[in-house]
């Protein structure tokens, strides 16, 4: 089982790459493969729960071919996750001690083979389209988790899922501020890496409560938020689609990013 490796700051950097071509599957649409851990602890999903977790976040469980294509495009993650064929794998570009798996010191997608469905791991999900827009929301006092839910709903939107954030990231959403997502996690999308934004690679960063990269933020702690509005939703009064809306009150300051 691959280890967590050293905890850098208090965030986990998921390098996520767009899958644009898969050998033998030339018509696969562009999309994103991402590692997903919906709860506060590592390796907690059975195979069935893994499939459901991807669906809940607006994605589907990834296929081995999709993970392989992501690996070939530079994707690395030292966390074992379920795939669609009930195998458990993880992609390693730069082999290191806790992540060697079945490949010794060679790069490649590590595999544990087909595993019993009751064993628990993380999951790799795939999302290929975003039928709407993700926008970053904030205000002076920011939001508890419940307030974030209510804020998004009051602006004709819902709190974005992790899958929606990954899809928006793949289409250019870049924000160096972590925000609430629908599963209670705290994440932020980085297209252009910079020192103050958690690492030297593009990706969606996950913020954990503890230095060992476990724990979700408390729902009563205050943070920004990412909202999602479906394509059919009507813009709020004072808002122009794709632009920066007029602030509904003197306190709120929110930014809409068309993706």
């Amino acid at each position: 089982t691959p280890g967590l490796g050293p905890a850098t700051a208090f965030t986990s950097e998921d390098l996520v790459v767009q899958v644009t071509a898969v050998p033998g599957q030339p018509h696969l649409p562009g999309g994103v493969v991402f590692h997903y851990r919906p709860g506060p602890t590592r390796y907690s999903l059975t195979f069935e729960e893994a499939q459901q977790a991807c669906l809940r976040t607006g994605a589907v469980i990834a296929s081995p071919e999709q993970l392989q294509a992501a690996y070939e495009a530079g994707y690395e993650q030292c966390d074992a996750g379920w795939l669609r064929d009930q195998t458990v794998r993880y992609p390693i570009v730069s082999p290191r001690t806790p992540c060697v798996g079945d490949k010794d010191s060679s790069p490649g997608v590590r595999t544990y083979g087909v595993r019993p469905s009751t064993e628990t791991y993380d999951v790799y999900c795939f999302v290929d389209r975003l039928e709407g827009e993700v926008f970053f929301a904030t205000r002076l006092e920011q939001f508890t988790f419940q307030e974030a839910l209510e804020f998004c709903e009051s602006h004709n939107a819902t709190l974005a899922t992790t899958g929606q954030l990954y899809a928006a990231w793949s289409r250019g959403l870049d924000k160096c501020y972590a925000g609430w997502l629908a599963d209670g996690s705290l994440r932020y999308p980085i297209v252009t890496p910079r020192p103050a934004c958690g690492g030297d690679k593009p990706g969606v960063r996950t913020v954990y409560l503890y230095p060992n990269q476990t724990g979700l933020p408390d729902p009563l702690s205050r943070h920004h938020a990412f909202c999602f509005r479906g394509i059919s939703a009507v813009p709020s009064p004072g808002e122009e689609e794709g632009g920066t809306p007029t602030s509904p009150s003197g306190v709120e300051e929110w930014i809409v990013t068309q993706v």
């Epitope: 700051a9 208090f10 965030t11 002076l140 006092e141 920011q142 160096c176 501020y177 972590a178 932020y188 103050a196 934004c197 958690g198 960063r205 913020v207 954990y208 409560l209 503890y210 933020p217 702690s221 205050r222 943070h223």
Partner: nanobody
Framework: EVQLVESGGGLVQPGGSLRLSCAAS????????MYWYRQAPGKQRELVAS???????NYADSVKGRFTISRDNAKNTVYLQMNSLKPEDTAVYYC?????????WGQGTQVTVSS
């Protein structure tokens, strides 16, 4: 570097009071939300109280009416006044803040409520 240093813990009898302090690095304090968490032996760390930039406060149901969080921006310090203490308040109390997409913790201060 972000530093949070708690003090004020100790042994107190049931019904007694304690005031915890958390001194924060000056550069981060005045514009940050601040939190007090606690962790009892064998239990998960839980959020006890929070205070926003404007001084708005929130409390866990278990401490409402007994604990008060406050801040002194001039002293870069956040306080937790704990009254009517109960044995179940025994825990290590931690100061916490969130800065540049990271959570930061103090080292904790032990509070023991026992007769």
């Amino acid at each position: 570097e972000v530093q949070l240093v708690e003090s004020g813990g100790g042994l107190v009898q049931p019904g007694g009071s304690l005031r915890l302090s958390c001194a924060a690095s000056g550069s981060i304090f005045s514009n940050r939300f601040m939190y007090w968490y606690r962790q009892a032996p064998g239990k998960q760390r839980e959020l006890v109280a929070s205070i926003t930039l404007s001084g708005s406060t929130n409390y866990a149901d278990s401490v409402k009416g007994r604990f008060t969080i406050s801040r002194d921006n001039a002293k870069n310090t956040v306080y937790l006044q704990m009254n009517s203490l109960k044995p179940e308040d025994t825990a290590v109390y931690y100061c916490n803040t969130f800065l540049q997409n990271s959570f930061y913790w103090g080292q904790g201060t032990q509070v023991t409520v026992s007769s």
